[in-house]
């Protein structure tokens, strides 16, 4: 006879799994809010700022009724990967003015990376179809000026905050449907 079977594999409780993802997302939302406020204090935004390379908004009040876990997690992961790339770019190419946002920007990058790994784990634990590997994204052009870097920072942090805000609400809603 072969070796005795190992302990029975306990299937994860999807609600508990989602709970911990919500906690991480909320925590990152608070971090992003603080960093965006810090940026506004140091470099007040004159009006709204957009960056064409940022993902388009995925959620709104109207979309909540049709939310499904695989779609939400896949889309959220894709959007957050894009924001991670933008934060990395900002730290590398944002110019000396944005160095005043360190080490907070580095901490945000690390926590964003952690949330992405958490989402990946959640998708595999819930046996959701894994998204195909991300195609290599075209490199982001460096800002044309110091002010261009600051405007990009406003757009990136504002967009990330909005994405995380809706993510918390969407994940909370999905938890009730499990």
């Amino acid at each position: 006879p072969g070796p005795p079977p190992g302990p029975p594999r306990v299937s994860p409780d999807p609600r508990a799994e989602l709970d911990s993802t919500v906690l991480l997302t909320r925590s990152l939302l608070a971090d992003t809010r603080q960093l965006a406020a810090q940026l506004r204090d140091k470099f007040p935004a004159d009006g709204d700022h957009n960056l064409d390379s940022l993902p388009t908004l995925a959620m709104s009040a109207g979309a909540l009724g049709a939310l499904q876990l695989p779609g939400v997690l896949t889309r959220l992961r894709a959007d957050l990967l894009s924001y991670l790339r933008h934060v990395q770019w900002l730290r590398r190419a944002g110019g000396s003015s944005l160095k005043t946002l360190e080490p907070e920007l580095g901490t945000l990058q690390a926590r964003l990376d952690r949330l992405l790994r958490r989402l990946q784990l959640l998708m595999s634990r819930l046996a959701l179809p894994q998204p195909p590997p991300d195609p290599p994204a075209p490199p982001l052009a460096p800002p044309s000026s110091a002010w261009g870097g600051i405007r990009a920072a406003h757009a990136i942090l504002g967009g990330l905050h909005l994405t995380l805000d809706w993510a918390v609400r969407g994940l909370l809603l999905l938890k009730t449907r499990l």
């Epitope: 905050h161 609400r169 909370l172």
Partner: antibody, heavy 117, light 110 residues
Framework: EVQLLESGGGLVQPGGSLRLSCAAS????????MNWLRQAPGKGLEWVGV????????FYADSVKGRFTISRDNSKNTLYLQMNSLRAEDTAVYYC??????????WGQGTLVTVSS | QSVLTQPPSASGTPGQRVTISCSGS????????VNWYQQLPGTAPKLLIY???LLPSGVPDRFSGSKSGTSASLAISGLRSEDEADYYC???????????FGGGTKLTVL
Amino acid sequence: EVQLLESGGGLVQPGGSLRLSCAASGFTFSHYDMNWLRQAPGKGLEWVGVISYDGSNKFYADSVKGRFTISRDNSKNTLYLQMNSLRAEDTAVYYCARTPGSHFDYWGQGTLVTVSS
Amino acid sequence: QSVLTQPPSASGTPGQRVTISCSGSSSNIGNNAVNWYQQLPGTAPKLLIYYDDLLPSGVPDRFSGSKSGTSASLAISGLRSEDEADYYCSAWDDSLNGVVFGGGTKLTVL
């Protein structure tokens, strides 16, 4: 700085109509769901309705369904509330507010609507 | 009659800690985020707490929120005279498909 400025309030007779506007500035208006809320004199807050960032979806409180319509013009950064078949109980200060998720993070200063004969 | 239930009034002396409760049901507080708003006399409401316990920028950490089951509470420590205002809790309601509020609590600083 985020700013929301309501206008269009005033005195109207029962059964009449009124259109409120909310001019937004200081943020990318087309990225945010927008709401109307109201507060009757000396009373609490009441949510009126919400419109999604692109205008494709709208939800209303039961008390105004079929009488009020929310719309928006993203090219003008403006939110609207068309109020028809007004009743005395619609008398209130009307606020527009921005929604980034489940909450209202910025509010306008409000505009007073009085429905009376 | 408000969907969420709050005490109509609360009071405290400067420096004290006060708590305002908000109770609902599984279709609102139980399943959704709770938010709190402060309305100073004669002004528009202002967001005070969101997603149960998060503070927006500019709100002092004397304010805190918590939630358990179908109830939530707002705590204010180190009470100040400028905290005298109306406080409202709010949540999305799945049954009504809309946002619901508590009736508001008038806080008096004695």
